[in-house]
Amino acid sequence: FSGSEATAAILSRAPWSLQSVNPGLKTNSSKEPKFTKCRSPERETFSCHWTDEVHHGTKNLGPIQLFYTRRNTQEWTQEWKECPDYVSAGENSCYFNSSFTSIWIPYCIKLTSNGGTVDEKCFSVDEIVQPDPPIALNWTLLNVSLTGIHADIQVRWEAPRNADIQKGWMVLEYELQYKEVNETKWKMMDPILTTSVPVYSLKVDKEYEVRVRSKQRNSGNYGEFSEVLYVTLPQMSQFTCEEDFY
C-alpha cells in the first residue's frame, strides 16, 4: 500500500465532497468488499463495518484494511492512517474511540486490498449518529372509558445510558410504535422530545406490544428499537371503582 500515491489520488478528487456513507445497509452487487454501515451511538465514538464476501472464492485477495483521513487543518492530513482498532466493534469493522472522534471535521475512509482501494466514503460524525435503544420502558394506567371498553396509558422510558442528555450534547427525539400482539402492522406516533407519552383508546381485552426508538434531533438516523414492552389491560370487572380512573 502506497500511502502518498493513494493520498494524492483521493485528495485530487476533494474527498470531502464524495458521496456520504448511507447509514443503512447496502446491497453488495459486486464481489468486492463494500462499506455497509458507519454508526456513532453518542457523537463521541464511531465504528464502520464492511462486507467480506470476497474471501469466499475470489482469487488473490489480500487482507482487507481500512484507512482514514480527517480534515484537521488547512488541507487534508497528508497521510492515510490505518484503522486504530479492528477488534472492538466486531468482525469486519473498525472502531474509533473518543480520541479519534470529533463532530467538527469531515472524515474520509477507504477499504483497501493488495494496495488498491475497493471502496471509499466521506461523512461527518453527526450524519452517522444512530443512538442505542431507549431503556427501562414501563407503563401506567391513566383512565378507563365509562363503557369499560377502552383505556388510556402513559408509557415512560429512559434515554440510552451513553447519550449525554443532561449537558445537551445530544438532543434525542423519540418515536413510539404500538400494536396488538396478533397484528403485524405497527401504529406509529408522531416524534416527541420527551421520555413519556400517553397512548389513547387501547382495547381493554387485548394485549399490546410497545416499542420506542430514538434519533438525534436534526441529523442522523433512527437507532434500533427498544425491547418490546407488553401491555395487558385488566378487564373492567377487576376495577373496584370506575371513578378512580377519572
Epitope: 476533494a14 470531502w16 484537521n72 487543518t73 467538527w104 471535521i105 469531515p106 461527518s124 441529523s219
Partner: antibody, heavy 115, light 108 residues
C-alpha cells in the same frame, strides 16, 4: 490563494437586524465547511456558527448565545457566506470573522450595537 | 462546553528569551483537536500550530507545541520582535468549538 472578504458590518440599534456577507475565492467553496467567529473589542475569540457543504446537507450549528437570533447560510453559486443577525443586543458588538474550517480567516467586519 | 483557561494572561519578555504559554481544559481534549493561533493588533488570527504539535504552513520552527489530556503548552524558543502578539488556544473535540482567553506576549 484562499481569500475571504467580509462586508455588511456597521452601527445598528439594539433589537435591529444586520446581514453580513463573506466573499470567498481561491478554493472550492461548495465543498467547504464555513464558520463565523467573533471578537468583542479588547476581548477573546468566540465561535458563532458553522454551515457545512451540500454533501453534508448544509447542516448548521450555532453557539447558544446566538441560537434563534442568528442564521448562517450560503450561496454556492456566488461563493458567498452570510450571517443574518436579528434581535441584536449590545453584547453582539464585535468584529465578525468569516473562516474556512477556522484555518483561514478574513480580515473581519465590525458590528456595533448601540442606542 | 469545554472551557480553556490560558495562563499567564500577560507575559513580559525580551527578544531572544524563551516563552512558555499554557492552556488548560476543563475536560480532556484529544491532541488532534487542539490548535494555537497568533493575533497581532488590527489583524485576523493566524493558525500557528494544529493538532497540538504540528506547525501550520509558513510558521518558523522556533514555535512548538506539546501536551495531552487537559494540559497543553505553546513554546517559543527564542522570541523575535514579530512574535509579540496575543496567542489563543482552541479546541473542537467534544463540545462546541471554544477558544482560550488569550495570552499576551509583550516586550519587557
Amino acid at each position: 490563494e484562499v481569500q475571504l472578504v467580509e462586508s455588511g458590518g456597521g452601527l445598528v440599534k439594539p433589537g435591529g437586524s444586520l446581514r453580513l456577507s463573506c466573499a470567498a475565492s481561491g478554493f472550492t467553496f461548495s465543498d467547504a465547511w464555513m464558520d463565523w467567529v467573533r471578537q468583542a473589542p479588547g476581548k477573546g475569540l468566540e465561535w458563532v456558527a458553522e454551515i457545512r457543504s451540500k454533501a453534508n446537507n448544509h447542516a448548521t450549528y450555532y453557539a447558544e448565545s446566538v441560537k434563534g437570533r442568528f442564521t448562517i447560510s450560503r450561496d454556492d453559486s456566488k461563493n458567498t457566506l452570510y450571517l443574518q443577525m436579528n434581535s441584536l443586543k449590545t453584547e453582539d458588538t464585535a468584529v465578525y470573522y468569516c473562516t474556512l474550517y477556522r484555518d483561514y480567516w478574513g480580515q473581519g467586519t465590525l458590528v456595533t450595537v448601540s442606542s | 462546553e469545554i472551557v480553556l483557561t490560558q495562563s499567564p494572561g500577560t507575559l513580559s519578555l525580551s527578544p531572544g528569551e524563551r516563552a512558555t504559554l499554557s492552556c488548560t481544559a476543563t475536560s480532556s481534549v484529544s491532541s488532534s483537536y487542539l490548535h494555537w493561533y497568533q493575533q497581532k493588533p488590527g489583524q485576523a488570527p493566524r493558525l500557528l500550530i494544529y493538532s497540538t504539535s504540528n506547525l501550520a504552513s509558513g510558521i518558523p520552527d522556533r514555535f512548538s507545541g506539546s501536551g495531552s489530556g487537559t494540559d497543553f503548552t505553546l513554546t517559543i524558543s527564542r522570541l523575535e520582535p514579530e512574535d509579540f502578539a496575543v496567542y489563543y488556544c482552541h479546541q473542537y473535540h467534544r463540545s462546541t468549538p471554544t477558544f482560550g482567553g488569550g495570552t499576551k506576549v509583550e516586550i519587557k
